[in-house]
Amino acid sequence: TLNSVLNSNAIKNLPPPLGGAAGHPGSAVSAAPGILYPGGNKYQTIDNYQPYPCAEDEECGTDEYCASPTRGGDAGVQICLACRKRRKRCMRHAMCCPGNYCKNGICVSSDQNHFRGEIEETITESFGNDHSTLDGYSRRTTLSSKMYHTKGQEGSVCLRSSDCASGLCCARHFWSKICKPVLKEGQVCTKHRRKGSHGLEIFQRCYCGEGLSCRIQKDHHQASNSSRLHTCQRH
């Protein structure tokens, strides 16, 4: 666990100032040998891999996406899975490895030359008629930050907050994710009482801006603890 690692958090072998491998405690994560890591249709073994629990793609690595490990599995149990390579099956952009996106259920290269026209097509296909889910994965139109040179303005489709312009974050809106304004002091925010609860929101709020945190409004007295209003407040 995090705390057990932190109780002995001194670095024994200092890394060089730049480059080289770090002698960071626990960098060789202990795991049972031969743990299989799903990637595309085949399984590959990743050294020292331990499945990481997640609620959304942003909690996983850049070469992963967040999903139930089994087809049609319990949507409440999600882990970070290896991204799908080109020509592998997909249901949303985040499932495809960096430099690829999901088109007609297949991961294809996000080649700058022909990408822009195709993505409009994909958005229409994904959202034109129905908003159902497949195999427990929610349909999303999300784009890799490597696909566009310009930062998304408010309302632009995104994959992660780094796709959005300064002062905006990438948050869920219906079955897509778009750039929304980062919350300011006094604005209502969402405090997730249990990990994974934000996976259920279809209108996700941004996080509080720099120097602010989401806390119970001091003057907001209600009988139920869970229904108290949370706002962005100074640290």
Partner: nanobody, 125 residues
Framework: EVQLVESGGGLVQAGGSLRLSCTAS????????VGWFRQAPGKERDFVTA????????AYADSVKGRFTISRDNAKNTAYLQMNSLKPEDTAVYYC??????????????????WGQGTQVTVSS
């Protein structure tokens, strides 16, 4: 390769605040985990806090929980460490470090491949 430069260190009185910045150049910053570490005179370098590529996950050493806040702005290729309620025992050279965030794991268990030169933080009583 990623080059990291820390700034914002200095001398502050106990109870005061400082905000450190770690600015990156080179490889894509937005795909890296960023950590802050500190080294007091005669001691080993310790983990302080870390943040994943998206900012969705953070971790803190017990000694700084509730006082320090890590954040990042990928558009500016910069990570921040807001340090409040500083104590004399927070005196150290603070280093920022970055590592590839391809596969999620405990934020204390990343291999930090690139390191800044450090910035001195001195807290007087």
């Amino acid at each position: 390769e990623v080059q990291l430069v820390e700034s914002g260190g200095g001398l502050v009185q106990a109870g005061g605040s400082l905000r450190l910045s770690c600015t990156a150049s080179g490889s894509a910053f937005s795909s890296h985990v960023v950590g802050w570490f500190r080294q007091a005179p005669g001691k080993e370098r310790d983990f302080v806090t870390a943040i994943n590529w998206s900012g969705a996950r953070t971790a803190y050493a017990d000694s700084v929980k509730g006082r320090f806040t890590i954040s990042r702005d990928n558009a500016k290729n910069t990570a921040y460490l807001q340090m409040n309620s500083l104590k004399p025992e927070d005196t150290a050279v603070y280093y920022c470090a970055a590592g590839r965030d391809r596969y999620a794991r405990d934020l204390t268990e990343y291999e930090y491949l690139w390191w800044g030169q450090g910035t001195q933080v001195t807290v007087s009583s």
